[in-house]
């Protein structure tokens, strides 16, 4: 069973840095949850190293991770989703390092998808919509979304808008005319569960209309 390494019982192993980080994804495959861990140092020799989680599990003491290249992975229904689990890096029966982690505080949502932008000529605005699989989930249902957009020529000049819904209106007058824009969105847990930003959705590209010289307004695309 996993426990904290005692001083002096690890010989040469304790000279290495086995620090690691993990994230959980709840109901990522039907009712199955996942937990993914990886070493922070990409140069760690992972040969013979295993990960094990003990505690805060349903009707089992511990679970072993599967190794997929340089990441370690569990898919299971057996997370209690309350309290701290003990996650350990092991060589055989020896624990090299352990962390107590509450899996509800390291949740990484799935990336939003189906991002699109529709121009409304009469309203002189752009309606941004996207979808998230979390609307159908039992647990991580409440998310904060971060919509980021930029003019394609402005490499690092992103404008960010935080919202809790999956619809956003961008006013035409706030955007440059006749310009190509890139827009993307990501999500983070926002109620009970805590954790990390999801991956970004695939980017969507749209062009703003030209300015209509007589009225000073943009022409529709």
């Amino acid at each position: 069973e996993s426990g904290y390494a005692q001083n002096g019982d690890l010989e040469d192993a304790e000279l290495d840095d086995y620090s690691f980080s993990c994230y959980s994804q709840l109901e990522v495959n039907g009712s199955q949850h996942s937990l993914t861990c990886a070493f922070e140092d990409p140069d760690v020799n992972t040969t013979n190293l295993e990960f094990e989680i003990c505690g805060a599990l349903v009707e089992v003491k511990c679970l072993n991770f599967r190794k997929l290249q340089e990441i370690y992975f569990i898919e299971t229904k057996k997370f209690l989703l309350i309290g701290k689990s003990n996650i350990c890096v092991k060589v055989g029966e020896k624990s090299l390092t352990c962390k107590k982690i509450d899996l509800t505080t390291i949740v990484k949502p799935e990336a939003p998808f189906d991002l699109s932008v529709i121009y409304r000529e009469g309203a002189n605005d752009f309606v941004v919509t996207f979808n998230t699989s979390h609307l159908q989930k039992k647990y991580v249902k409440v998310l904060m979304h971060d919509v980021a957009y930029r003019q394609e020529k402005d490499e690092n000049k992103w404008t960010h808008v935080n919202l809790s819904s999956t619809k956003l209106t961008l006013l035409q007058r706030k955007l440059q005319p006749a310009a190509m824009y890139e827009i993307k969105v990501r999500s983070i847990p926002d109620h009970y569960f805590k954790g990390f930003w999801s991956e970004w959705s695939p980017s969507y590209y749209f062009r703003t209309p030209e300015i209509n010289n007589s009225s000073g307004e943009m022409d529709p695309i």
């Epitope: 069973e1 996993s2 426990g3 904290y4 003990c54 505690g55 805060a56 599990l57 349903v58 009707e59 089992v60 003491k61 511990c62 209690l80 989703l81 309350i82 309290g83 701290k84 003990n86 107590k100 509450d102 039992k138 647990y139 009970y192």
Partner: antibody, heavy 119, light 105 residues
Framework: EVQLQQSGPELVKPGASMKISCKAS????????MNWVKQSHGKNLEWIGL????????SYNQNFKGKATLTVDKSSSTAYMELLNLTSEDSAVYYC????????????WGAGTTVTVSS | EIILTQSPAITAASLGQKVTITCSAS?????MHWYQQKSGTSPKPWIY???KLASGVPARFSGSGSGTSYSLTISSMEAEDAAIYYC????????FGGGTKLEIK
């Protein structure tokens, strides 16, 4: 003050079922597991199972599967344990106990509910 | 399943005497907890995660151990320490030891 208020003693007939309640106060009910423990003959303690009050997820000792069913009512911060198909072996004191999720020990206990199964 | 064996089952100590109660696990465990129970009352958390004293527990109590062997020690027995002490495994299925009854000699 953190408290767990359990329902009163019960005298039930063999084959019957019954439900014990445990009302929590003084803390966030959904932030801790609720555990149930059986004490027979004033000595042996046996963990029956637990419930996550936020999600309703349960975990049972295999010895009590089919014997106990754990539920919660979040609106009243009350946990329940239903005992099924009672026999004389089920005569005992039953405790609810809050689970500290940082260390997995039972940090607050109810006063216990005495269940006597007799015809 | 982890089996916890406490010894002795019953022991008596004089006031001021040092007392040690042991808990032996059938296989290696990471953490152990201890509870105190007096007649007619519910168990009280006493020592958690091997050596941390629960709120209100006197400093004369201590806990130690690793692997399969854990112990609760009272440095100087007092009358109020007479009780049954239970060890408990930290993980599923949260097994308890059979208890050690500590009496005053």
């Amino acid at each position: 003050e953190v408290q767990l208020q359990q329902s009163g003693p019960e005298l039930v007939k063999p084959g019957a079922s019954m439900k014990i309640s445990c009302k929590a106060s003084g803390y966030s009910f959904t932030g801790y597991t609720m555990n149930w423990v059986k004490q027979s003959h004033g000595k042996n303690l046996e963990w029956i199972g637990l419930i996550n009050p936020y999600s309703g997820i349960t975990s049972y000792n295999q010895n009590f599967k089919g014997k106990a069913t754990l539920t919660v009512d979040k609106s009243s911060s009350t946990a329940y344990m239903e005992l099924l198909n009672l026999t004389s072996e089920d005569s005992a004191v039953y405790y609810c106990a809050r689970g500290d999720g940082n260390y997995w020990y039972f940090d607050v206990w109810g006063a216990g509910t005495t269940v006597t199964v007799s015809s | 399943e982890i089996i916890l064996t406490q010894s002795p089952a019953i022991t008596a100590a004089s006031l001021g005497q040092k007392v040690t109660i042991t808990c032996s696990a059938s296989s290696s465990v990471s953490y152990m907890h201890w509870y105190q129970q007096k007649s007619g009352t519910s168990p009280k958390p006493w020592i958690y995660e091997i050596s941390k004293l629960a709120s209100g527990v006197p400093a004369r109590f201590s806990g130690s151990g690793s692997g399969t062997s854990y112990s609760l020690t009272i440095s100087s027995m007092e009358a109020e320490d007479a009780a049954i002490y239970y060890c408990q495994y930290w993980n599923y299925p949260y097994t308890f030891g059979g208890g050690t009854k500590l009496e005053i000699k």
